[in-house]
């Protein structure tokens, strides 16, 4: 299709080389009431369309994204050619930063309902560059945490080193929806609730003598509870003796609950005590079996290919630890009688 009639928007993504970062493009197709630009190449001001203007934006999950190759080749369907770019409804998610994301991205409705809709498309010229200025060493992160129940703020990473006074007007989006009341480089949250979690986008306009473009940054906001004050809790095994059959294989599971910590380094391991000796056992990797806002349950198993007489004299100890402290649970094997 002919993209010459598409409205054009220029965007800049300046990414930090020291952090993981995502980026998004919205398919900014005009809303019905301001969709005249879809038809401006087709109608003179005196002409009035007999049908309503383009309505595709009512269901923006129905859009198609393309990339325009720089060598003039035909448009490429994003879904087929770019595994690191994901389409979610009307939004294009870039999962990894890099200058190779620079280029022209075009979106248009999948369903063309009338000849007027053919020109209803948006071309986004995206320039991607690494952050070079070291002047702003402490720019806001692209991953920000809000503590539930307290006050907090979300800062626009590309503007966090500027004072509120010198900051340009910012347009904020949350999960793709415009936050019309927010215009500063920082959103202040009086009391944090779990619904404040999400993907925030901040845009501001930068201009030079030739042109203007939108500078965009994406912030993943997580609502969290305060760090736990408790050591981990062993949930299994609860018995300190276990009846076993000699010569049979045995798996003993250790499950422990770890409270939330922002910097989370849980330790869960098995070791064996045999008279005065003790040694750590190399066992399968630990795995998370349940995760909530407040805590996580992690499991690690010890596997004996077959239980021997020697194992009955040993103690199998599960050791769990977080930044607060540690807990242990020992298990003594006992031969099953009869």
């Amino acid at each position: 299709f002919n993209i010459s009639g598409c409205s054009t928007k220029k965007l800049l993504w300046t990414y930090s080389t020291r952090s993981e970062e995502e980026f998004v493009l919205f398919c900014d197709l005009p809303e019905p009431q301001k969709s005249h630009f879809c038809h401006r190449n087709r109608l003179s001001p005196k002409q009035v369309p007999e049908h309503l203007p383009f309505m595709g934006s009512n269901d923006l999950s129905d859009v198609q994204w393309y990339q325009q190759p720089s060598n003039g080749d035909p448009l490429e369907d994003i879904r087929k050619s770019y595994p690191h770019i994901i389409q979610d409804k009307c939004t294009l998610h870039f999962l990894t930063p890099g200058v190779n994301n620079s280029g022209s991205y075009i979106c248009r409705p999948k369903m063309i309902k009338s000849p007027y809709d053919v020109a209803c498309c948006v071309k986004m010229i995206l320039e991607v560059k690494p952050q070079t200025n070291a002047s702003c060493e402490y720019s806001a992160s692209h991953k920000q945490d809000l503590l539930l129940g307290s006050t907090g703020s979300i800062s626009c990473p590309s503007l966090s080193c500027q004072s509120d006074a010198q900051s340009p007007a910012v347009t904020w989006y949350k999960n793709g929806k415009l936050l019309s009341v927010e215009r500063s480089n920082r959103i202040v949250v009086d009391e944090v609730y779990d619904y404040h979690q999400g993907t925030y986008v901040c845009d501001y306009t930068q201009s030079d003598t030739v042109s203007s473009w939108t500078v965009r940054a994406v912030v993943q906001v997580r609502t969290i509870v305060g760090d736990t004050k408790l050591k981990p809790d062993i949930l299994d095994p609860v018995e300190d003796t276990l009846e076993v059959e000699l010569g049979k294989p045995l798996t003993i599971s250790c499950k422990a609950r770890f409270g939330f910590e922002r910097v989370f380094n849980p330790v869960i391991k098995w070791y064996i005590k045999d008279s005065d000796l003790e040694w750590e056992v190399s066992v399968p990797e630990a795995k998370s079996i349940k995760s909530t806002l407040k805590d996580e349950i992690i499991e690690r198993n010890i596997i004996l290919e077959k239980v021997t007489q020697r194992d009955l004299r040993r103690k199998f100890v599960c050791f769990v630890q977080n930044s607060i402290g540690n807990t242990t649970q020992s298990v003594q094997l006992k031969e099953k009688r009869g």
Partner: antibody
């Protein structure tokens, strides 16, 4: 809060199930214990059920009691009561950490079980 | 298993007085000790945890102390409402093991 029910007079050998109903907190976050007290005697720990449904019983209680739970209740089944099991049975939230020490709080008012022929 | 021994079995004191209850563990339990109060016809109530920390809403007339194997509960400015049986409990718990309570001490207020 925690409240026990189901205590009554039963004949020896007749199974009996006591129920502990909780409100104001979730059993998916806390272990629950049963403790009993014979008339004029001290507290005797029976066992607990934790958030992943692992159960623990003190040695003397093994085989004599079974603890199970639903989303808001914790049951204690006395499999074959004897006259020695006559006591007030308490349900308590815990063991759970307070200052990294395991305590029991709150306790229910208790329910009296009398085993007699 | 840890065995908790409480002394005396019964103690009597006048209103305004002070009573001291002792609890001995058969092995060192750090400061892993709680005290409970049980009034006649009622259920136990947590008073003190970690040997010396007052539970929420408990009067500062109750004081816990001790470490290792020897622990003490002191009730000062005795009131009639303090007439109850007091139990100590080893709160160290590594996932299993019995939860040993002491035998209890009856406090009679005259």
């Amino acid at each position: 809060s925690v409240e026990e029910s189901g205590g009554r007079l039963v004949a020896p050998g007749t199974p009996l199930t006591l129920t502990c109903t909780v409100s104001g907190f979730s059993l998916s976050n806390y272990a629950m214990s049963w403790v009993r007290q014979a008339p004029g005697k001290g507290l005797e720990y029976i066992g607990f059920i934790n958030i992943i449904d692992s159960t623990y019983y003190t040695n003397w209680a093994k085989g004599r009691f079974t603890i199970s739970k639903t989303s808001t209740t914790v049951d204690l089944k006395m499999t074959s009561p004897t006259t020695e099991d006559t006591a007030t049975y308490f349900c308590a939230r815990g063991p759970y950490y307070v200052n990294n020490e395991n305590v029991f709080d709150p306790w229910g008012p208790g329910t009296l079980v009398t085993v007699s022929s | 298993d840890v065995v908790m021994t409480q002394t005396p079995a019964s103690v009597s004191a006048a209103v305004g007085g002070t009573v001291t209850i002792k609890c001995q563990a058969s092995q060192s339990i750090g400061s892993s000790l709680a005290w409970y109060q049980q009034k006649p016809g009622q259920s136990p109530k947590l008073l003190i945890y970690s040997a010396s920390n007052l539970a929420s809403g408990v009067s500062s007339r109750f004081k816990g102390s001790g470490s290792g194997t020897e622990y003490t509960l002191t009730i000062s400015d005795l009131e009639c409402a303090d007439a109850a049986t007091y139990y100590c409990q080893c709160t160290y718990y590594g996932g299993s093991g019995d939860v040993p309570f002491g035998g209890g001490t009856e406090v009679v207020v005259k």
